[in-house]
């Protein structure tokens, strides 16, 4: 059974009184409709809450919305609907919050049918004041901020025009027509696809990919026969139709589309798809869908140029295009990812990698759990994690797995223990070492969140009945205390805490359980008095990440280096604080074969660290397209894993010979590229 509230748990002294003094209720004078909540800036305490209520009239639906603002992390709210002239805000666009601490907010308003364009409300002072601006177009998408300059906005119109503003939405200019998809790149660059004939849908596979680096003064066509494109890390990907048939291939660029290389990935047919699962500046995880409606595909991991790919995981669960995958980046430990595979018997199993996709294994069975009915052997089974797919299947899973970069090693997830994911009611499990070992933390489904960089974990039971109790733990989920935050239970709708897990405030949202009228209500609990003092040096202990065998000289080495972290001791009840920075100390490891991926045309047999030639490619020269030229690859089968920092030790060398031949792919030969200026 899970650890809980027993006499052996270290109880936090006088916590009821401390929390009661720090529990703040706010009842919103709105009928129950929908509510959306956004944090404005980092560590500002500013929260915007938009409530919307649809009143069905005879012919149409009348919408009413209210806007509230808090500047103390949700303890108090002020109705600021008058700042937006009591206008109905379109919730499908959400609240567009500016990057970093710009303090910028854009709300998109609903306007009457006959108007020339839409309307936005803009704030650049953390929603203290708003300016109404009428648009010369009707927006199709939310306003998108340039990551580099929050004054630069782009939006698509319902007429497929690409509109740009250089003064935070004050003035807008249509820079291109017939646009399907637009994205900001780095350095205020905009990438977008255009159609020539009928529409985005009709021209799919015949779109052009354009780039502007000066907000629409000049353009460059950087791709033709485009199906779609995506950005990930420093990579620009385009899915391009093949010349002769209906298949398409991925091309990749690392120079904003000036030069392209064909990715060594399988081509896909009309019914298949590619998906960038994760990307950073070193590499990318790419999912390639299997032919037919299988619901699975293959994960490939790239080299540092995004060109050469290694097969990472077979039978990776990913339902049809735009569907669900359980692929999760465990942000609390470098190199760790969790996902699901679809077994031959159609059961779903969880797999984990600790080395960025090099090897995948099952999750170790929690010591305090028994194998369930899915297990053939009652002593041998694994933990299986519920993520997006389970949620989409309406299983009793209120939340996806949770990890935070500043709560080192902590992963919280719903799961079941057996040979595969079970449809039975799940429990909540925690790992404090990035997924190597797990413990049952709470019985039954819960909502959970991490506060104070892991110093506090808060949970609320998932129930159809009204609730009034919150649980919290100050020792990474080993022991739990319960706190009754209100006498009158509420229908719970969500837990909200400031993104980044640095806050000590949690807001419990719901609506009153009264028979006649239902109103939105929030309870904000500040845990600062539970963690009475600031943590000191003595409150931390040293932890070696990825440690599996202390007797191994290279214990803890992942991607060529090991990292030791200062971590809060489980018994320490103190504040990490808002300014907490993870203290870590890296040390470089000697290279071994584990630091190299198998090159194109090579693979690793199971339980072997050596790369061997794929039989069907034995003796062939490997040709691939690089920067518009055909290359000749002479290889001994190994290449360094992107981001691997090892030195010395084993060093298999690879060599690429340039034959200076023209590339067989006619995608974007230099003469096909064209530029134009407005």
């Amino acid at each position: 059974s899970a650890p809980g509230e027993d006499e052996e748990c270290g109880r936090v002294r006088d916590f009821v009184a401390k929390l009661a003094n720090n529990t703040h209720q706010h009842v919103f004078d709105d009928l129950r409709g929908s509510v959306s909540l956004s944090w404005v800036g980092d560590s500002t305490g500013v929260i915007l809450v938009l409530t919307t209520f649809h009143v069905p009239l005879v012919i149409m639906t009348f919408g009413q919305s209210k806007l509230y603002r808090s500047e103390d992390y949700g303890k108090n709210f002020k109705d600021i609907t008058d700042l937006i002239n009591n206008t109905f805000i379109r919730t499908e666009f959400g609240m567009a919050i500016g990057p970093e601490n710009s303090g910028k907010v854009v709300l998109t308003a609903e306007v009457s049918g006959g108007s020339r364009g839409g309307r936005i409300f803009r704030s650049s002072d953390f929603a203290k004041n708003f300016v109404q601006t009428d648009l010369p177009f009707h927006p199709l998408t939310q306003m998108m901020y340039s990551p580099q300059n929050s004054d630069y906005l782009l939006a698509l119109s319902t007429e497929n025009g690409l509109w740009v503003s250089k003064n935070f939405g004050g003035k807008w200019e249509e820079i291109h027509k017939a646009v399907c998809l637009a994205k900001w790149g780095s350095d205020n660059t905009i990438f977008f696809t255009t159609y020539a004939n009928g529409s985005c849908k009709a021209d799919l596979g015949a779109l052009e990919l354009w780039r502007t680096s000066d907000l629409g003064k000049s353009f460059k066509t950087i791709g033709v026969k485009i199906y779609s494109f995506g950005l990930g890390g420093r990579f620009l990907f385009a899915s391009v139709m093949a010349d002769k048939d209906t298949t398409r291939r991925i091309h990749v660029s690392t120079d904003q589309g000036d030069t392209w290389s064909m990715a060594q990935l399988p081509s896909v047919g009309q019914e298949q798809f590619y998906s960038i699962l994760a990307a950073n500046d070193d590499m990318v995880f790419m999912h390639v869908d299997e032919p037919g409606d299988t619901g699975f595909g293959t994960i490939f991991t790239s080299d540092d140029r995004g060109i050469v790919y290694s097969k990472s995981l077979d039978r990776h669960l990913y339902t049809t295009t735009g569907g669900e995958t359980d692929f999760t980046n465990v942000t609390s430990l470098r190199g760790v990812y969790i996902t699901s595979v679809l077994s031959e018997d159609n059961s779903i199993q969880t797999m984990i990698t600790f080395d960025q996709g090099g090897r995948w294994t099952h999750l170790r069975k929690p010591e305090n759990s028994e194998c369930d009915a899915t297990a053939k052997n009652k002593n041998e089974c694994s933990l299986h994690i519920h993520a997006s797919y389970s949620i989409s299947q309406k299983l009793n899973v209120p939340m996806a797995p949770l990890s935070e970069p500043n709560a080192v090693g902590i992963v919280i997830a719903h799961g079941s223990v057996g040979d595969a994911i079970s449809v039975m009611v799940p429990d909540v499990y925690i790992s404090d070492d990035g997924g190597y070992s797990w413990t049952k933390m709470l019985e039954g489904p819960h909502y959970y969140t991490i506060l104070d960089s892991g110093g506090i974990i808060v949970a609320i039971e998932h129930s159809s009945r009204p609730i009034n109790v919150i649980k919290f733990s100050t020792d990474e989920g080993q022991c739990w205390q319960t706190y009754t935050f209100t006498r009158d239970p509420i229908y719970f709708t969500g837990l909200a805490s400031e993104p980044g897990a640095r806050s000590m405030n949690i807001s419990i949202w719901g609506f009153t359980a009264s028979f006649l009228t239902s109103q939105w209500v929030s309870y904000t609990i500040d845990f600062k008095d539970i963690l009475e003092r600031n943590c000191e040096e003595k409150d931390y202990t040293i932890w070696l990440a990825h440690s599996t065998d202390p007797e191994d000289y290279e214990d803890g080495c992942i991607l060529g280096y090991k990292e030791q972290f200062l971590r809060l001791r489980k018994s320490s009840v103190c504040q990490n604080g808002r300014d907490y920075v993870v203290t870590k100390q890296p040390s470089i490891c000697l290279c071994s074969l584990e630091d190299f991926l198998c090159d194109f045309g090579y693979y690793r047999p199971e339980n072997d660290s050596k790369c061997v030639e794929q039989p069907e490619l034995k003796g062939h020269d490997l040709e691939f397209c690089l920067y518009g030229r055909e290359e000749h690859l002479t290889t001994n089968g190994y290449r360094k894993i992107p981001g691997d920092k090892c030195q010395g030790g084993v060093n298999p060398v690879r060599e690429v010979k340039d034959l200076k031949k023209k590339c067989t792919s006619n995608f974007l030969s230099p003469e096909k590229q064209n530029s134009k200026s407005n």
């Epitope: 202990t541 040293i542 440690s547 030791q564 018994s571 040390s587």
Partner: antibody
Amino acid sequence: QVQLVQSGAEVKKPGSSVKVSCKASGGTFRNYAISWVRQAPGQGLEWMGGIIPIGGWANYAQKFQGRVTITADESTSTAYMELSSLRSEDTAVYYCARQGRKTGYYYYYGMDVWGQGTTVTVSS
Amino acid sequence: DIQMTQSPSTLSASVGDRVTITCRASQSISSWLAWYQQKPGKAPKLLIYKASSLESGVPSRFSGSGSGTEFTLTISSLQPDDFATYYCQQADGHITFGGGTKVEIK
């Protein structure tokens, strides 16, 4: 089999310093923390501090902070404990001990290998 | 720092007796507790780690239990070789030892 061999007995004057060494053999020295524990005549055990050879991360018991320095030399698999401003109450047997480790936590699993002890006598 | 209180400080027992030594932490230390045996003139020897895990090579008559703040070392049937001083040690704060329990012949 891992062994910890400590330097020989020392007699010191009050106010001076003593440096005790602890050499490891037969194991992966770098991957374990080494703690120093002392025991005054007829008294119990008292932890002074510890070090992790990789990166040389040392931490000390509050009582000895500022007076004790623990270091490690990975190349010779040796840990050192230096205690300064000696007084008569520092007369004790000083042990080095390897912190057992089953996970990434260096100090949580007890001290599984001990040195033979070094007697330090502080007397004027 | 976390204080460890061991009791009793001295315990008289005979061969074959079941012996129980307790250790109390001033705050919760989860299961991060170790037990040692020390004989005169010798270095301590690890018996139990993580409150209840038996160190390899230690006879199974030694067992540990408890978590949080209350811990127990039990010797199910005292043997002549077991007369010694026993120490508990917590590892979830800066390491601290209990005062010791001397098990002597009755």
